[in-house]
């Protein structure tokens, strides 16, 4: 997606992108797991939520996340008919009023309680590098993706399109 110039073209476009509708175009309730089939789980500890990446026991129930999909205009130089340049952005909410947020300063992924309209830190560009896997790229920091680091979710910088296929930024969605 980034070509020879890395993320430069894309960085400008993402910062300029705007969500075209305030309501989501579609929503899914799904469990989130890593490329290696570890589950993403959420636990309430000391009045705040922690996010874990772990192997579940055989019959343990997977946590569900509400993924809300928004269309976003992608400014581009392509000579389209106004239709081109749409991206899908998602917000991820494991429980009412809490959303995953990108903390770019700490390179961390956190759960924050907030009201709508959600801040840009809660929006992630949806990528399908493989048909059954998705990646989530920070709207606020193009080229930075949600990934797995030391059994936690973290923000991981991806500097070329080849690295978009690295397993630690690939996730599986399961609606069952």
């Amino acid at each position: 997606a980034f070509g020879i110039s890395g993320v430069q073209k894309y960085t400008r476009a993402l910062h300029d992108s705007s969500i075209t509708g305030i309501s989501p175009i579609t929503e899914y309730l799904a469990s989130l797991s890593t490329y290696n089939d570890q589950s993403i789980t959420f636990a309430l500890e000391d009045e705040s939520y922690e996010i874990y990446v772990e192997d579940l026991k055989k019959d343990e129930k997977k946590d569900k996340v509400l993924l809300s999909y928004y269309e976003s205009q992608h400014p581009s130089n392509e000579s389209g008919d106004g239709v081109d340049g749409k991206m899908l952005m998602v917000t991820l909410s494991p429980t009412k009023d809490f959303w995953l947020h990108a903390n770019n300063k700490e390179h961390s992924v956190e759960l924050h309680k907030c009201e709508k309209p959600l801040p840009d830190q809660a929006f992630f560009v949806l990528h399908n590098m493989h048909s059954n896997c998705v990646s989530f790229e920070c709207k606020t920091d193009p080229g930075v993706f949600i990934g797995v680091k030391d059994n936690h979710l973290a923000l991981i910088k991806v500097d070329s399109s080849e690295n978009l296929c690295t397993e630690n930024i690939l996730f599986k969605l399961s609606e069952t």
Epitope: T26, H127, H130
Partner: antibody
Framework: QVKLLQSGAALVKPGASVKMSCATS????????VSWVKQSHGKGLEWIGE????????NFNENFKGKATLTVDKSTSTAYMELSRLTSEDSAIYYC???????????????WGQGTLVTVSS | NIVMTQSPKSMSISVGDRVTMNCKAS??????LAWYQQKPGQSPKLLIY???NRYTGVPDRFTGGGYGTDFTLTINSVQAEDAAFYYC?????????FGGGTKVELR
């Protein structure tokens, strides 16, 4: 403007293979999933599969696994589909299509090529 | 695979009529549904996606509705150029499947 230009009609013998092309222009080829759709009188519209030029990842309808092979040439922004071991059941119009979204496949077909007619006959 | 069933198979209408066609999914598909129009000798064209979102450039006389298993495409005040086949398609999940189509012809 977005264009998907497909190769011309093909008349092929049973048991043979055919490879058709879909030359694209007007958009960033590597950033969109390309799908192929079959239209026949007997079965209507059927999705064959899709390919993402950026990663080379593909995804097939089970009914077409082993029948269709999808490839791309990023240097010419062209997608290809090869159909093997052809029978009369494969006689149809084949369309290449593209979705509305950068980077993501929702298997929605926003742009279509003009179609390639394949006739299998001895 | 989820089966998409369209009804009626064909309908004969007059210019200015309001027409509604149906698409039924064999399982709940949420709002993961698209509608296409295909005129003779042409490729299909996307009209509606995610059940009710009109695609860019599609006239506002085309309206999609429904959720779950039952969906409709309505054409308000049909124009002569609307004579075509209309197909519904389940989107998002693989494999996407199409309905058999509804033929709309002018009287």
């Amino acid at each position: 403007q977005v264009k998907l230009l497909q190769s011309g009609a093909a008349l092929v013998k049973p048991g043979a293979s055919v490879k058709m092309s879909c030359a694209t222009s007007g958009f960033s080829f590597t950033d969109y999933w390309v799908s192929w759709v079959k239209q026949s009188h007997g079965k209507g519209l059927e999705w064959i599969g899709e390919i993402y030029p950026n990663s080379g990842a593909d995804n097939f309808n089970e009914n077409f696994k082993g029948k269709a092979t999808l490839t791309v040439d990023k240097s010419t922004s062209t997608a290809y589909m090869e159909l093997s071991r052809l029978t009369s059941e494969d006689s149809a119009i084949y369309y290449c299509t593209r979705g509305p979204y950068y980077y993501s496949t929702q298997i929605i077909f926003a742009y279509w090529g003009q179609g390639t007619l394949v006739t299998v006959s001895s | 695979n989820i089966v998409m069933t369209q009804s009626p198979k064909s309908m004969s209408i007059s210019v200015g009529d309001r027409v509604t066609m149906n698409c039924k999914a064999s399982q709940n598909v949420g709002n993961n549904l698209a509608w296409y129009q295909q005129k003779p000798g042409q490729s299909p064209k996307l009209l509606i996606y995610y059940a009710s979102n009109r695609y860019t450039g599609v006239p506002d006389r085309f309206t999609g509705g429904g959720y779950g298993t039952d969906f409709t495409l309505t054409i308000n005040s049909v124009q002569a150029e609307d004579a075509a086949f209309y197909y519904c398609q389940r989107i998002y999940n693989s494999p996407p499947t199409f309905g058999g189509g509804t033929k709309v012809e002018l009287r």
